[in-house]
Interface confidence: low
Amino acid sequence: MMTGTIETTGNISAEKGGSIILQCHLSSTTAQVTQVNWEQQDQLLAICNADLGWHISPSFKDRVAPGPGLGLTLQSLTVNDTGEYFCIYHTYPDGTYTGRIFLEVLESSVAEHGARFQIP
């Protein structure tokens, strides 16, 4: 039975050219996290494996940095980065938990930075 829940930074916005942190936190379960995948729509951004550490997809390596924690930092944002992002927690014995974040990259300087920088 899957009892865990994922808290995310939710819907966030940021300015073009800036950076943003995507953060998820799995709670209410004693399951062991074996791997966390970060995906944008159907593209793999990064993997954090409990044994092997981080792997950043080559096509994103210049703009995606690991952390803080199991989160992901996106920099040099473009309007094309607008969209859905998913944190996929692979756990044992529960299985897979998925969290969703929607990022909107704005042209203007009125973007509200909704990301929480502290780790829950």
Partner: nanobody, 113 residues
Framework: EVQLVESGGGLVQPGGSLRLSCAAS????????MGWFRQAPGKEREWVAS???????WYADSVKGRFTISADNSKNTAYLQMNSLKPEDTAVYYC???????WGQGTLVTVSS
């Protein structure tokens, strides 16, 4: 329990340099990455730089070409070499690494003439 201890902050004139250190302890393995964030008075904490265990580095645009992050994996220590410092670099600098709650106490960097 993972602990992070930053050091190396201080008062420096514009154009000057500082080297920050972050010593991580309590790990049963070498962390796969370490990074630096900073928080200026009245502002949100912002990411500065990260380094993977394999040596790959990332920098915020605001510090590219001026700051260099590195790590000594054998000592679980990260460094931030800061050159050509500007008044807007004034902030408390925090080290962090993998896990859910590893933040150090921070070290204050003040750039002022």
């Amino acid at each position: 329990e993972v602990q992070l201890v930053e050091s190396g902050g201080g008062l420096v004139q514009p154009g000057g340099s500082l080297r920050l250190s972050c010593a991580a302890s309590g790990f049963t393995f070498s962390p796969s990455w370490m990074g630096w964030f900073r928080q200026a008075p009245g502002k949100e904490r912002e990411w500065v730089a990260s380094v993977l265990r394999g040596g790959y580095t990332w920098y915020a645009d605001s510090v590219k070409g001026r700051f260099t992050i590195s790590a000594d994996n054998s000592k679980n220590t990260a460094y931030l070499q800061m050159n050509s410092l500007k008044p807007e670099d004034t902030a408390v600098y925090y080290c962090t690494t993998e896990g859910f709650d590893p933040w150090g106490q921070g070290t204050l960097v003040t750039v002022s003439s």
